[in-house]
């Protein structure tokens, strides 16, 4: 720890002093630097300032002081482990006091209402003071006008000037002034008292349909003394007819851009095609928008969404009947379809197109395909721009004949009926088969009702002349192929139950 | 620039069969499907089928399905339209069209027309 | 098949006027089509889906209509548009002509 003692303290002029002091112990690290560091207890204590460092093998150093500052000084040695326990303070020395010999800086002066001026600054900092106190002399003019300067002497940090007019240019200066006199001649600053709406009207040159959508906006730059305040830039609001959201028949969704004062052109994207649109451009300044100039415009057509719910059904072995909705967005004026599909083992070869020249087909009956081989089915709408985004299914009719699984079959029962009932797969080829129904038990002796014939496609039947609280065995054949068996019992004797509402019944 | 180049007129005698050609130049031939439309001296126009060149699928007019067969050589870019069993009212103007872009579904682009003249 | 029936089959105008060719369909299309064809020349597309231009076309020409019924406008006649004007529809194949409407000068 280096020694400084009170001796080693010597003011030199009433803006310097010399300070000394003994080395520091290096422990075996050479000292690289000593920082010499002051405080005022009366104006920021217990905070410590560096007035400068000088090289380890210095143990003297002249510092140049600031007037009215009760400096209280402490040397701290640094090695390349760091600084080691700063040295026991110096007595007190305070600087006589003198004029600032600095000025406030950042002045500014701009409106917060449209007819007044708040000049404001960045306070000196107590080490410039100078003395105890520190006012501020503000002084302004309308520039230009070679006029006399008003002026005020203020301690806060702003001054408000009223009863300005709109937008009106000032030079403005700001002095620092304490009891030893006034702060160096200060620079003049430019403000401009409060700024009004904006009464310029933005004059579109024209709109630029890009694609279907995007378009570029263009203006004309507006006349900068109808702008009443700065011009911050433009406002571009758009929104499209018809946007209304459906539970608020008030609100419309608008697009917003704000585009820098310099440019006067923008470009909106992400439009709807085939949308009319509203636009509406307004200068604004600090103050706010002006008004503005509006614009009514369409975007064109583009292709269309993808189709809807692409069903295939099966026909027979060699035919698909095609369903489907048209796309969501039709972008445009739908004007049909386009179907292609290929067989999936031929890797995309053999692609056949059909082009569906009418918007309203919701249904396309494929023939001739092959019941060995698994298509994929592309369906596309189209406007006049062309084909959309496709819609894929794969499917043929190979894997959609013959009987299915009859996935989620099931049975329930009343006093003297039941109701089968399934889910057909979608595409299956419907068929027909026979519904058996056979009693169990010793009294019933295994009596069968006779077969009933029955589509796939019906989803459920209804067997009814059953006997009450008895077994039976439900048998499904196709072609006399035994197909699926399931178990089912009648309710016990009592009031007859309708079955459920809408089973078909045969 | 797109352009159809048919070949030129024929007479021949009925029961006979005559075949036109139209070579396509100026586009991707197979990206178009191409149409054949005649028109007998003085009347309308009447559509007799269409055919497409990537796959060689055709899709003919009921009157005409039993007697017109369309082709497609991609190599040379040229679709040809046969039809057979002339009779003397098939006298008339045969013209290609290429249907536009897909989904504005019109004739974009005609061939200057092959005229066949059936008679005894 | 779509009968198409054309009005009027034949019309005398002078340079300037308006014409107005109608096309009726015997069910309801869709789109109608347009092809204007001058003397020993092959058909020239006019107007496709209803209303709009094919590539060329001046825009004293315009489509409209729905249904069954269609119009061919041509707003101020030219000396150039003297010719035989047909309509097609095309909602489903065979695609079927009008019978033409020709535009003669008077």
């Known amino acids: 720890v280096p020694r400084l003692v009170l001796s080693d303290l010597h003011l030199l002029t009433q803006s310097q002093v010399r300070v000394s002091w003994s080395p520091a112990e290096d422990h075996n690290a050479p000292i690289e630097k000593y920082d010499i560091e002051f405080e005022d207890k009366e104006m920021a204590p217990e905070k410590w300032y560096s007035l400068g460092k000088v090289p380890g093998n210095q143990t003297s150093t002249t510092l140049k002081l600031s007037p009215y500052v009760h400096y209280t000084f402490r040397v701290t040695a640094i090695n390349k482990y760091g600084p080691g326990e700063p040295s026991p303070v110096s007595e007190t020395v305070v600087t006589p006091e003198a004029a600032p010999e600095k000025n406030p800086v950042d002045v500014k002066g701009e409106g917060n209402e449209t007819t007044n001026m708040v000049i404001t600054w960045k306070p000196l900092r107590w080490m410039d003071w100078n003395a105890p106190q520190v006012q501020y002399r503000v002084q302004w003019r309308p520039q230009g006008t070679r006029g006399p300067w008003q002026e005020q002497i203020v301690s806060d940090p702003f001054l408000v000037v009223s009863n300005t007019s709109t937008f009106v240019p000032y030079e403005i200066k700001v002095q620092a002034v304490n009891s030893q006199g006034k702060g160096p001649e200060p620079q003049v600053t430019i403000g401009y008292s409060g700024e009004d709406y904006p009464q310029a009207i933005p004059e579109l040159e024209g709109i630029e349909i890009l694609n279907s959508s995007a378009v570029l906006v263009k203006w004309r730059p507006v006349d900068l003394a109808q702008v009443k305040g700065h011009l911050r830039g433009y406002n571009v609001t758009y929104w499209r007819e018809g946007s209304q959201r459906k539970h608020s028949k008030r609100h419309i969704h608008k697009d917003h851009v704000v585009v820098p004062a310099n440019t006067t052109s923008v470009i909106l994207s992400g439009l709807r095609p085939y949308s009319s649109y509203h636009l509406e451009v307004q200068a604004f300044n600090g103050r706010g928008s002006g008004p503005a100039s509006e614009f009514t415009f369409s975007t064109p057509e583009g292709v269309p969404g993808h189709p809807e719910a692409l069903h295939l059904e099966c026909q027979s072995n060699t035919s698909l009947l095609l369903r489907w909705q048209p796309p969501l967005s039709h972008n445009g004026v739908l004007t049909g379809y386009v179907l292609s599909y290929h067989p999936l083992d031929e890797g995309g070869k053999g692609q056949l197109s059909f082009n569906l020249r009418d918007p309203e087909l919701r249904t396309h009956n494929l023939t001739d395909l092959s019941p060995h081989l698994r298509y994929r089915f592309q369906l596309q709408a189209t406007t006049k721009e062309g084909p959309g985004e496709a819609i894929v299914r794969e499917g043929g009719t190979m894997a959609l004949s013959g009987i299915s699984d009859f996935g989620n079959i099931s049975a329930t029962a009343g006093e003297n009926y039941s109701v089968v009932s399934w889910v057909p797969k979608e595409g299956q080829c419907n068929f027909r088969f026979h519904i058996l129904f056979k009693a169990l038990g010793e009294e019933k002796g295994g009596a069968s009702l006779s077969p009933q014939y029955v589509s796939y496609n019906q989803s459920s039947y209804t067997q009814w002349d059953l006997q009450p609280d008895t077994d039976y065995e439900i048998h499904l054949f196709k072609e006399r192929m035994f197909r699926h068996q399931m178990a089912v019992k009648t309710n016990g004797t009592g009031r007859v139950r309708l079955p459920p509402a809408g089973f078909a019944t045969e | 620039e797109v352009q159809l180049v048919q070949s030129g007129a024929e007479v021949k005698k009925p029961g006979a069969s005559v075949k036109v050609s139209c070579k396509a130049s100026g586009y991707t031939f197979t990206s178009y499907t191409m149409h054949w439309v005649r028109q007998a001296p003085g009347q309308g126009l009447e559509w007799m089928g269409d055919?497409?060149?990537?796959?060689?699928?055709?899709s003919y007019n009921e009157k005409f399905k039993d007697r017109v067969t369309m082709t497609t050589d991609t190599s040379t870019s040229t679709a040809y339209m046969e039809l057979r069993s002339l009779r003397s009212d098939d006298t008339a103007v045969y013209y290609c069209a290429r249907e536009g872009a897909t989904g504005t579904w019109y004739f974009d682009v005609w061939g200057q027309g092959t005229t066949v003249t059936v008679s005894s | 098949d779509i009968q198409m029936t054309q009005s009027p089959s034949s019309l005398s105008a002078s340079v300037g006027d308006r014409v107005t060719i109608t096309c009726s369909a015997s069910?309801?299309?869709?789109?109608m089509f347009w092809y204007q064809q001058k003397p020993g020349k092959a058909p020239k597309p006019l107007i496709y889906?209803?209303?709009n231009l094919a590539s060329g076309v001046p825009s004293r020409f315009s489509g409209s209509g729905s249904g069954t019924d269609f119009t061919l406008t041509i707003s101020s006649l030219q000396p150039e548009d003297f010719a035989t004007y047909y309509c097609?529809?095309?909602?489903?194949?065979?695609?079927?002509f009008g019978g033409g409407t020709k535009v003669e000068i008077k």
């Open positions: 889906l209803t209303s």
């Open positions: 069910s309801s299309v869709s789109f």
């Open positions: 097609q529809q095309w909602r489903s194949n065979p695609p079927t």
């Open positions: 055919i497409n060149p990537n796959y060689g699928g055709t």
